[in-house]
């Protein structure tokens, strides 16, 4: 089918575009290019006979056209007014016609934009601002980017006018980035110089430091105050209320007792007028205090939180220790001490990181210890467990199941019969039971304070008949003289006896057979080839018995030493060697032939015609099991002698 | 042997209209593409119309474009020229021709079309 | 459109002459030119085709040649039924078929 592929779709003013004909027809006489939908005489750019190769100018000519033997159109030095449909009709020699129709779209090249702002200092927490994309464009799409990142979703940040006009609202000293704006349409992209965003804020509540609010007798008083502000904020210091300097640090050296108090510390703003202040007490000790525990969480919530244990008071030039369990710390990637070793951070708790914890502050004569703390992880709950697990009962008997997670605090239970609430209680009891309580018994779990809920669902059948058994085994393909395979008669059933066989007899007595778990289970250990047998359990009540189907145990040996047949190791001289190696392996192995230790073939037979002298040396078979992943060989030494040189040499096969 | 047989001229008042035809012999007819081609009294050949041997595309001169309708029956052998508005310069001898690519090989007698009040 | 134009429009000659007609189309149009006969009263004859050709049935002191612009149509040795009108032809577009004015050719 005629078609017409614009190269390009979207073309820039100014540059060209080629309206390229595919599946142009054989045997043409002419061909004629229209702009629009249709074939319109008034609307006819050029014409071109093929025979003549005359190209002929239409009323829609504008010299921008040249059309080229094969019927493709070039328009160059596009114009806004060329987009839209083109309509290629093609007359054969026969004077069938054809016609397709094909489009392009002319877009402007961008300038590069820049970018207006309604308010240069904004206020954080007060002020909106609005960036303006300039200029405005036709057909253009607006983008912006925050640090070279698109927009962040935001309620604060609004995009309008058409994506022109980025509002934020509310603005925060987060808002603090560099604003670009791009103006984008099918042929170009241009992307404006970067306005930075200059958000006055603060002064937030100023931050006294260090932190330790404890100090011996004789040290020097460094405090440093800060408060995040823009401009930067102005400082005043009192002590006691009563004023002291004007600057961000404040520096008493050899301080005693009496220089214990109130320090504050005030921020000025002269831009946002504001005024914030923060108050530490400092203590004075004559001797270290009695150190003791805080916690940032009381109850975390197992491999969900983290717990920071913190040594107080905060002290300077002093040694904190620790010990979990009356231990010194283990070494653990889950355990991280601060870099005065005053805090202590359990990453993602256990129900194991109960404790207790004790910290420990070392003067020079001793280590006082804080009181243990003890943490309260809740955790779980775990899958549930239903005891007992039997899944067959016979009827008239009592069912009584018990449900257990392991849980903190402890779980609520509940039981569910076919997905149908009975009772919220930890025990089930059915007294007297019949075919009728046969089902799918749920117990649900539930952690009221970690908000988590488990489920562990059991199928009970109540029937005089006992099912036909079936056998589970945890190795399908066990290896020889290495696995053990352990065979299961499945389902566990109340009152129950388990028997078993072996190729239709009653177990063989072997140190390597084992029955446990009320005979319910048989363990094969270090299974050998001859143990690939089958194996068939059977249950049996006082009303009922039953069989499994057998099951044939696989087991993987070998490869064992090959053999290379035949014996012979004399040929004569142009006799054929016909080789061939065999070992006992399961399964199959890869068989492999080396001469003089060279690789030959990946076969089990090893043939040459006429053998020479030439052919003399060692053959060795090599043999490998990838189930097993072991290997074995053997080498046979061949002599070929000269014709008739001597007596008893094998012709040969 | 080709024979192509015009019929259908005459003499019509301006406005007016009439319809020619034009019987083929001995050729398969539907392989080829046909055309008119007419005369004026004392002047040289101009050409008309032309249509593909289906009859699927048809081809104008601009002088009877929109009035002028060129139309073929191939299980009758015929094409047919049905003139509209007809107008004192239609006046010709109106020929139909057989086409092969780029030549028109065979022609007919002619008709005579006289417009005329 | 490509014009085509003829010369001479009229020329008298006498039985026996070798006659030339000429046409010149105002842009190459390679070797696509056809000749065709007319007798009064009667159609139009394709005569040479593609600007050498001979149509079937022609008699062979018909020839054309030319290529490009200018083309010529011989008459070797001319006959009493060769008085007639010749007229040049090649394809175009949007006419499918431009005609040349016509060279008669009368009796001297």
């Known amino acids: 089918k005629l078609t017409i592929e614009s190269t390009p779709f979207n073309v820039a003013e100014g540059k060209e575009v080629l309206l390229l004909v595919h599946n142009l027809p054989q045997h043409l006489f002419g061909y004629s290019w229209y702009k629009g939908e249709r074939v319109d005489g008034n609307r006819q750019i050029i014409g071109y006979v093929i025979g003549t190769q005359q190209a002929t100018p239409g009323p829609a000519y504008s010299g921008r056209e040249i059309i080229y033997p094969n019927a493709s159109l070039l328009i160059q030095n596009i114009i806004q007014n060329d987009t839209g449909f083109y309509t290629l009709h093609v007359i054969k020699s026969d004077l069938v016609n054809e016609e397709a129709t094909g489009q392009f779209r002319v877009y402007p090249e961008l300038p590069k934009p820049s970018i207006s702002s309604n308010n240069s200092k904004p206020v954080e927490d007060k002020d909106a601002v609005a960036f303006t994309c300039e200029p405005e464009t036709q057909d253009a799409t607006y983008l912006w980017w925050v640090n070279n990142q698109s927009l962040p979703v935001s309620p604060r940040l609004q995009l309008s006018n058409g994506n022109r006009t980025l509002t934020l609202f509310n603005v925060t000293r987060n808002d603090t980035a560099s604003y670009k704006c791009e103006t984008q349409n099918p042929v170009s992209a241009r992307r404006s110089d970067s306005v930075i965003l200059n958000v006055l804020y603060g002064p937030d509540a100023p931050t006294i430091s260090p932190l330790n609010t404890s100090y011996r007798s004789g040290e020097n008083l460094n405090l440093s105050c800060h408060a995040a502000s823009n401009p930067p904020a102005q400082y005043s210091w009192f002590v006691n209320g009563t004023f002291q300097q004007s600057t961000q640090e404040l520096f008493i050296p050899n301080i005693t007792v009496n220089n214990s108090g109130s320090y504050t510390c005030q921020a000025h703003n002269s831009d946002t007028g504001l005024n914030r202040t923060t108050v530490t007490t400092i203590t004075v000790y004559a001797e270290p205090p009695k150190p003791f525990i805080t916690s940032n969480n009381s109850n975390p919530v197992e491999d969900e939180d983290a717990v920071a244990l913190t040594c107080e008071p905060e002290i300077q030039n002093t040694t904190y220790l620790w010990w979990v369990n009356n231990q010194s710390l283990p070494v653990s990637p889950r355990l991280q001490l601060s870099n005065d070793n005053r805090t202590l951070t359990l990453l993602s708790v256990t129900r194991n990181d109960v404790g207790p914890y004790e910290c420990g502050i070392q003067n020079e004569l001793s280590v006082d210890h804080s009181d243990p703390v003890i943490l309260n992880v809740l955790y779980g709950p775990d899958d549930p467990t239903i005891s007992p697990s039997y899944t067959y009962y016979r009827p008239g008997v009592n069912l009584s199941l018990s449900c257990h997670a392991a849980s903190n605090p402890p779980a609520q239970y509940s039981w569910l019969i076919d997905g149908n609430i009975q009772q919220h209680t930890q025990e089930l009891f059915i007294s007297n039971i019949t075919e009728k309580n046969s089902g799918l018994y749920t117990c649900q779990a539930n952690n009221s304070a970690s908000g988590h809920s488990r489920t562990t669902v059991k199928t009970i059948t109540v029937s005089a008949e006992l099912p036909k058994p079936s056998i589970s085994s945890n190795n399908s393909k066990p290896v020889e003289d290495k696995d053990a395979v352990a065979f299961t008669c499945e389902p566990e059933a109340q009152n129950t006896t388990y028997l078993w066989w072996v190729n239709g007899q009653s177990l063989p007595v072997s140190p390597r057979l084992q029955l446990s778990n009320g005979n319910r289970t048989l363990t094969l250990f270090n299974v050998t080839r001859n143990d690939a047998r089958a194996y068939v359990c059977g249950i049996q009540n006082s009303v009922s018995a039953n069989r499994s189907d057998p099951v044939t145990l696989d087991v993987l040996y070998g490869p064992d030493t090959p053999i290379i047949s035949p014996p012979d190791s004399s040929y004569l001289s142009g006799a054929n060697l016909n080789l061939s190696c065999h070992s006992a392996s399961n399964p199959s192995p890869q068989y492999s032939w080396r001469i003089n230790g060279i690789p030959q073939q990946h076969t089990q037979v090893l043939f040459i015609a006429k053998i020479t002298p030439n052919n003399n040396g060692t053959y060795a078979c090599f043999v490998s099991n990838l189930a097993t992943g072991r290997n074995n060989s053997i080498v046979k030494s061949i002599t070929v002698s000269a014709s008739g040189t001597s007596p008893g040499l094998s012709a040969g096969a | 042997e080709v024979q192509l047989l015009e019929s259908g001229g005459g003499l019509v008042q301006p406005g007016g209209s009439l319809r020619l035809s034009c019987a083929a012999s001995?050729?398969?007819?539907?392989?080829?593409?046909m055309s008119w081609v007419r005369q004026a009294p004392g002047k040289g050949l101009e050409w008309v119309s032309a249509i593909s041997g289906s009859g699927g595309s048809t081809y104008y001169a601009d002088s009877v474009k929109g009035r002028f309708t060129i139309s073929r029956d191939n299980s009758k052998n015929t094409l047919y020229l049905q003139m509209n508005s007809l107008r004192a310069e239609d006046t010709a001898v109106y020929y139909c021709?057989?086409?092969?690519?780029?030549?028109?090989?065979?022609w007919g007698q002619g008709t005579l079309v006289t417009v005329s009040s | 459109d490509i014009q085509m134009t003829q010369s001479p429009s009229s020329l008298s000659a006498s039985v026996g002459d070798r006659v030339t007609i000429t046409c010149r189309a105002s842009?190459?149009?390679?070797?696509?030119l056809n000749w065709y006969q007319q007798k009064p009263g009667k159609a139009p004859k394709l005569l040479i085709y593609?600007?050498?050709s001979l149509q079937s049935g022609v008699p062979s002191r018909f020839s054309g040649s030319g290529s490009g612009t200018d083309f010529t149509l011989t008459i070797s040795s001319l006959q009493p039924e060769d008085f007639a009108t010749y007229y040049c032809?090649?394809?175009?577009?949007?006419?499918?078929?431009?005609f040349g004015q016509g060279t008669k050719l009368e009796i001297k």
């Open positions: 593609a600007a050498s």
């Open positions: 032809q090649q394809p175009s577009y949007p006419s499918l078929f431009t």
């Open positions: 842009q190459s149009i390679r070797g696509y």
């Open positions: 001995g050729f398969t007819f539907s392989s080829y593409a």
């Open positions: 021709a057989r086409y092969s690519p780029y030549v028109l090989d065979y």
